[in-house]
């Protein structure tokens, strides 16, 4: 039988589950561990003080419990502050606590103390320097200063002045007495150790403002824009550069050392990139303002004036044209234009237009067309209708006939055609 | 007929001036750079100054700057070259040229010269 | 400053034969950009010099075909296939790479 179904080995609530390996396991509620949830979670009371993590675990069938501490907190509950939080080791040194909970400091070669913050005297500690080399003592440690014929750390070695070579920058060194060398120097290079690049610059051939930066045997010209090259000899055609070197549409010319730029009207200025003022020579009358645009000015009028420059009365403020007509202003003389609207004509637009006078007759299928003021009627014949008398007057749509007699339009009329037994006009 | 023609040569003491005219005819000066070249007797040719076109931009080798000044007036088509502090060795004869085009800097037209002369 | 070096400084030809001048230049007259403008003219006696080639191997407009230019670099050549009566004077290379602009010394060409 399946494990769990045997009386649930489980005990405080715990759930048995069965693994696949078909034995049985519990799932323990909060606050119990142990196989059987036999055993009282140790951090369910929250041992663990600030934000120390509670992990707990059981060993020989005995529930315990570990804190996991927070930076700068200590001790089985992380209730003991850490001595080593405030970096109280000097030079590295490296920081533990000890059994007393201060701190300890291991410090490295060079120094001491309890923080590491003294220096070690290494010239009072023995003699370090060998060959009668002058002992000389640094922040954490020492060196040597040896006499003539010996070198290394600790003046352990006789010297040869080759060994290392100290010659600089690819300098060959040369042994020219017991203690004494020369340094060949490469081309570009000068002083004992061939440690000083030679400015090449003096004598520099950069023309056209160029700048001499000096190199290693050798010098570079730094050119102003105008000029390239290695000497700065070469001119520039700036009519080729990317982007254009003049502006707006205008027209480019190379010149020796610079460029000239033809600009289009309205612009100008060195690459064609200002707009002209035309406000600065516009002449708006008093009260318009003047608006800049390219090559050209725009006035905006005051009410009551109109005209390129605003100098013209605006005749559309006393109202000349009829109602819904549209008034303009003519900009050259100041006269008011009426754009008139449907069935009106004349200078004010207040003449009715007689549309049944003018050309063919509007009123389709013989209606009679009658004018009004502003618009015409069409007055229908027989069987027709719509505004224009052009929609034929379905008569069959009120359906007149009867006895399920079929019926046929006709141009003002019908027709009923009746079913065998029926007759009349209506089939009634 | 495309024609360049100098004038305003003459014979000058060492320390005098001299001013050199070139009139152009036959193209529309105002389009092209100009430039003056130099060729002392029995010698090759020297170039002494360039202008572009508007007159806005001018350059002179070492040996004639600071005492040579090159300059045009467009609406006269004419070229003009103001030759100060003159000395014995500019003696030459003086022919302005005109600039084809202003990327590869070549003359494709030459005046007939004007002979200068810098002498005691 | 650039200098130019022609070969020969003089010549003396018969008419029919080909002749050919070199001009040498102390630096490249390769622009920076890629081209190279070295140019010939042509001072027939008495007159201003006349303009022969230009960028190293473009004939000038009107300029005989027997006439042609080649070369890069610093090294530069100017040919005549046939030589013609016409054709006596002293020829100038030129450069305009660099400035100043400069001549070369100049070759006579005398006809034998």
């Known amino acids: 039988a399946p494990p769990c179904l045997d009386g649930s080995p489980c005990a405080n609530g715990g759930r048995c589950t069965q693994l696949p390996s078909r034995e049985a396991a519990c799932l323990c509620p909060p606050g119990w561990v142990g196989e059987r949830c036999q055993l009282e979670d140790p951090c369910h009371s929250g041992p663990c003080a600030g934000r120390g993590v509670c992990q707990s675990s059981v060993v020989a069938g005995t529930a315990r419990f570990s804190c996991r501490c927070p930076r700068g907190f200590r001790g089985p509950d992380c209730s003991l502050p850490d001595p080593c939080l405030s970096s109280p080791c000097a030079h590295g040194a490296r920081c533990s606590v000890g059994p007393d909970g201060r701190f300890l400091c291991s410090c490295p070669p060079g120094y001491q103390g309890r923080s590491c913050r003294s220096d070690v005297d290494e010239c009072r500690v023995g003699e370090p320097c060998r060959h009668g080399g002058t002992c000389l003592n640094t922040p954490g440690s020492f060196r040597c200063q040896c006499p003539a014929g010996y070198t290394g750390p600790l003046c352990e070695n006789p010297a040869v002045p080759c060994a290392p070579s100290p010659c600089r920058n690819g300098g060959t060194c040369r042994q020219s007495g017991d203690l004494t060398y020369d340094c060949a120097c490469l081309p570009g290079f000068e002083g004992q150790n061939c440690e000083v690049n030679v400015d090449d610059c003096p004598g520099h051939r950069c023309l056209n403002g160029g700048t001499c930066v000096d190199g290693v045997n050798t010098y570079n010209c730094q050119c102003p824009p105008e000029w390239t090259g290695q000497f700065c000899t070469e001119d520039v055609d700036e009519c080729q550069l990317q982007p254009n070197a003049c502006h707006n549409g205008g027209t480019c010319f190379n010149t020796l050392g610079g460029h000239s730029c033809v600009c289009v009207n309205g612009w100008t200025g060195e690459s064609c990139s200002q707009n002209i003022d035309d406000c600065a020579t516009a002449v708006c009358f008093h009260g318009a303002t003047c608006h800049d645009r390219v090559a050209s000015f725009y006035c905006a009028c005051p009410m009551g004036k109109t005209g390129l420059l605003c100098h013209l009365d605006d005749a559309c403020v006393s109202n000349p044209c009829h109602e819904d007509a549209i008034c303009d202003t003519n900009p050259v003389n100041g006269r008011a234009i009426c754009t008139c609207p449907p069935g009106f004509t004349g200078g004010a637009c207040d003449q009715d237009v007689d549309e049944c006078s003018i050309g063919a007759n509007p009123c389709e299928h013989l209606g009679r067309c009658v004018n009004t003021q502003g618009s015409f009627l069409c007055q229908c014949g027989r069987g027709y209708t719509g505004p224009r008398c052009e929609t034929d007057v379905n008569e069959c749509l009120s359906g007149p006939c009867r006895n399920q007699a079929t019926c046929l339009d006709r141009i003002g009329q019908f027709t009923c055609i009746c079913m065998a037994g029926f007759t009349g006009t209506y089939c009634e | 007929e495309v024609q360049l023609l100098e004038s305003g040569g003459g014979l000058v003491q060492p320390g005098g001036s001299l001013r050199l005219s070139c009139a152009a005819s036959g193209f529309a000066f105002s389009h092209y750079d100009m430039s003056w070249v130099r060729q002392a007797p029995g010698k090759g040719l020297e170039w002494v100054s360039y202008?572009?076109?508007?007159?806005?931009?001018?350059y002179y080798p070492d040996s004639v700057k600071g005492r040579f000044t090159i300059s045009r007036d467009n609406s006269k088509n004419t070229l003009y070259l103001q030759m100060n502090s003159l000395r014995a060795e500019d003696t030459a004869v003086y022919y302005c040229?005109?600039?084809?085009?202003?990327?590869?800097?070549?003359?494709?037209?030459w005046g007939q010269g004007t002979m200068v002369t810098v002498s005691s | 400053d650039v200098v130019m070096t022609q070969t020969p400084l003089s010549l003396s030809v018969t008419p029919g034969q080909p002749a050919s001048i070199s001009c040498r230049s102390s630096q490249s007259l390769v622009h920076t950009y890629g081209n190279t403008y070295l140019h010939w003219y042509l001072q027939k006696p008495g007159q201003s010099p006349q303009l022969l080639i230009y960028k190293v191997s473009n004939r000038f407009s009107g300029v005989p075909d027997r006439f042609s230019g080649s070369g890069s670099g610093t090294d530069f050549t100017l040919k005549i296939s046939r030589v013609e009566a016409e054709d006596v004077g002293v020829y100038f290379c030129?450069?305009?790479?660099?400035?100043?602009?400069?001549f070369g010394q100049g070759t006579k060409v005398e006809i034998k």
């Open positions: 040229g005109r600039h084809a085009t202003t990327a590869y800097w070549y003359f494709d037209v």
């Open positions: 030129s450069q305009s790479t660099h400035v100043p602009w400069t």
């Open positions: 202008i572009s076109r508007g007159g806005g931009s001018t």
